[in-house]
């Protein structure tokens, strides 16, 4: 297993609709054809897997149908979008990248993106 640098923004504010997008960039030392991207959430020192996708270079990322993540790839960059976020989902979202094929296997873990999520203010009751 060899180490690889992964860069991601430090702080992102999700939209009022609970959507957050950020780029995860990795310094690929070779010509990988198969890449696995995993998003981990760290909150109160607990780490959980949010979503994961394996893709062939040049193809779209394919997450599971019920995943809250979507993404696109371009070269050594992965543009990740996480949706359905609520205030309680505020936390550090860490991008983990694995170059699966061809060997050697490379692993890179970013420092994390702190995603702040603000629940929208409830609309005042109005009579029409």
């Amino acid at each position: 297993c060899k180490a690889m640098h992964v860069a991601q923004p430090a702080v992102v504010l999700a939209s009022s609709r609970g959507i957050a997008s950020f780029v995860c960039e990795y310094a690929s030392p070779g010509k990988a054809t198969e890449v696995r991207v995993t998003v981990l959430r760290q909150a109160d020192s607990q780490v959980t897997e949010v979503c994961a996708a394996t893709y062939m270079m040049g193809n779209e990322l394919t997450f599971l149908d019920d995943s809250i993540c979507t993404g696109t790839s371009s070269g050594n960059q992965v543009n990740l979008t996480i949706q359905g976020l609520r205030a309680m989902d505020t936390g550090l979202y860490i991008c983990k990248v694995e170059l699966m094929y061809p060997p050697p296997y490379y692993l890179g873990i970013g420092n994390g993106t702190q995603i702040y999520v603000i629940d929208p203010e409830p609309c005042p009751d109005s009579d029409f």
Epitope: V11, V12, L13, A43
Partner: antibody
Framework: QVQLVQSGAEVKKPGASVKVSCKAS????????ISWVRQAPGQGLEWMGW????????NYAQKLQGRVTMTTDTSTSTAYMELRSLRSDDTAVYYC??????????WGQGTLVTVSS | EIVLTQSPGTLSLSPGERATLSCRAS???????LAWYQQKPGQAPRLLIY???SRATGIPDRFSGSGSGTDFTLTISRLEPEDFAVYYC?????????FGQGTKVEIK
């Protein structure tokens, strides 16, 4: 080193608007956020809101909603805070601060805004 | 809105003494999102502690933070002359982000 430098003091009349700038250096501007905090004379710190320099999304304190606008110019690594319909109780020192993973650091030197007729 | 109440309002102590400052939240705050700042007259606030207990870069180890839930504490083990200032706690786990009203540490 990481630094935030704010624009100079302003004197405004009630009802006018003020726009304070905050120029960042020493770090990747779009990787962080900028928060604005004000402090009336002899009073404590009041959080006004913040902007994510990465995507431009904003979160404002409810009491200022509709009067405040926070923006960034990523080409010059500068954040702006505009406050409209100024009142005498808006007289304060206005600070910008970098929003990190779980901290505000560093802070700008502050900009005194005086609202007086 | 989470209200942070700091006590005491003023702490009168001598250099070399221990200072214990309290910050109580009206609702539970994740300790990841509780910070302490120091402010001296005419200066901008300075980050001391983040994540309730982690010291910021360059902050002397006489400053320490602790607590969880609704009760947080900033301790200055031995007051130095430059430590006399106003201290604020802040939470940013729940919007709106809020500050306590401050505790002034003054020379006795």
């Amino acid at each position: 080193q990481v630094q935030l430098v704010q624009s100079g003091a302003e004197v405004k009349k009630p009802g006018a608007s003020v726009k304070v700038s905050c120029k960042a250096s020493g770090y990747t501007f779009t990787s962080y956020g900028i928060s604005w905090v004000r402090q009336a004379p002899g009073q404590g710190l009041e959080w006004m809101g913040w902007i994510s320099a990465y995507n431009g999304n904003t979160n404002y304190a409810q009491k200022l909603q509709g009067r405040v606008t926070m923006t960034t110019d990523t080409s010059t690594s500068t954040a702006y805070m505009e406050l409209r319909s100024l009142r005498s109780d808006d007289t304060a020192v206005y600070y910008c601060a970098r929003v990190g993973v779980n901290w505000f650091d560093p802070w700008g030197q502050g900009t005194l805004v005086t609202v007086s007729s | 809105e989470i209200v942070l109440t700091q006590s005491p309002g003023t702490l009168s102590l001598s250099p070399g003494e221990r200072a214990t400052l309290s910050c109580r939240a009206s609702q539970s705050v994740s300790s990841s999102y509780l910070a302490w700042y120091q402010q001296k007259p005419g200066q901008a606030p300075r980050l001391l502690i983040y994540g309730a207990s982690s010291r910021a870069t360059g902050i002397p180890d006489r400053f320490s933070g602790s607590g969880s839930g609704t009760d947080f504490t900033l301790t200055i083990s031995r007051l130095e002359p430059e430590d006399f200032a106003v201290y604020y706690c802040q939470q940013y786990g729940s919007s709106p982000w809020t500050f306590g009203q401050g505790t002034k540490v003054e020379i006795k």
